[in-house]
């Protein structure tokens, strides 16, 4: 069988801060099993941004429906971006053991944070 | 505290039809996927059906696909499971449950019995 | 016939160790739990993905993994934990949920 290939086929993302953001991630096979995590940010000092097995991400929500047991849609939207949000974010699957361990990543995509448009009021 | 009640169990004759329902409470019912597991008198677990959070995808063994349909209320917190063209092999307790992420079991019902008899 | 084997019965002396193995999902696919069924009673979960105790069980219960075979292990065994055992899986390769014949434990004395 071919090996499982994490895909997140967006290098960037732009948004304007309020608004939310999605961000892609595909994999090309359900096995081996183990959940799927996104992070901003690599290396130890990396940002969880949400688990699929366990954890509140109350600005998170999966775009697909994750309880789907064929699912491979791993794509997320965030929402409320604000410029703090700015970064790369990495789909990262994990092997299942004790604990899991990571198995492969995707290339990560950046997200960049527009100014909020401001409304200019007219008078006439 | 996260509560599943099924009902709806009975005596039925063989090639007849029930439905059972289970109602759910103590958690977001819309949020987890959701399955039937069947225990025949004196025997084994065995599982008979499930359905994703949305119900739109919905799974079962050989040994009742085409004759049972789980089917899922959200707005009423209820799982269904209709059962078609019973056989004497169909007595058990069935035994709603609610999966994980990786679709294992964490909660259960207390059971309803099924009797398929003439 | 189960897709998944263990043993039909285990006995122990109380306050000793008891384990129940279960084998026969292949480890890149598959996800155990464990499951308790007292006579008359639903079952209740007591491990699931191989080696994860609900917050509620004791933790005399764990679930350990090697290779294609999971274990369940008893330590400290109480009369109370007499009962029938059952391992359950998820296979993702068939979007199936495959359970053992069981296993009686017996509390010995």
């Known amino acids: 069988e071919e090996e499982l290939q994490v895909i997140q086929p967006d290098k960037s993302v732009s948004v304007a801060a309020g608004e939310s953001a999605i961000l892609h991630c595909t994999v090309t096979s359900l096995i081996p099993v183990g959940p799927i995590q996104w992070f901003r940010g690599a290396g130890p000092a990396r940002e969880l941004i949400y688990n699929q097995k366990e954890g509140h991400f109350p600005r998170v929500t999966t775009v697909s429906e994750s309880t789907k047991r064929e699912n491979m849609d791993f794509s997320i939207s965030i929402s409320n971006i604000t410029p703090a949000d700015a970064g790369t974010y990495y789909c990262v699957k994990f092997r299942k053991g004790s604990p899991d361990t990571e198995f492969k990543s995707g290339a990560g995509t950046e997200l960049s944070v527009r100014a909020k448009p401001s409304h200019h009021h007219h008078h006439h | 505290e996260v509560q599943l009640v099924e009902s709806g169990g009975g005596v039925v004759q063989p090639g007849g039809s029930l439905r059972l329902s289970c109602a759910a409470s103590g958690f977001t019912f819309s949020s987890n996927a959701m399955s039937w597991v069947r225990q025949a008198p004196g025997k084994g677990l065995e599982w008979v059906a499930g359905i994703s959070a949305g119900g739109s995808d919905t799974y079962y063994p050989a040994s009742v696909k085409g004759r049972f349909t789980i089917s899922r209320d959200n707005s009423k917190n209820t799982l269904y499971l209709q059962m078609n063209s019973l056989r004497a092999e169909d007595t058990a307790v069935y035994y709603c449950a609610r999966e994980t992420w990786n679709h294992l079991f964490d909660y259960w019902g207390q059971g309803t019995l099924v009797t398929v008899s003439s | 016939s189960y897709e998944l084997t263990q043993p039909p019965s285990v006995s122990v002396s109380p306050g000793q160790t008891a384990r129940i193995t279960c084998s026969g999902g292949s480890y890149s696919s598959y996800y155990y739990a464990w499951y308790q069924q007292k006579p008359g009673q639903a079952p209740v979960t007591l491990i699931y993905?191989?080696?994860k105790r609900p917050s509620n069980i004791p933790e005399r219960f764990s679930g350990s993994s090697s290779g294609t075979t999971v274990t369940l292990t008893i330590s400290g065994v109480q009369a109370e934990d007499e009962a029938d055992y059952y391992c359950g899986g998820y296979d993702q390769s068939s979007y199936t949920n495959p359970f053992g014949g069981g296993t009686k434990l017996t509390v010995l004395g």
């Open positions: 993905s191989d080696d």
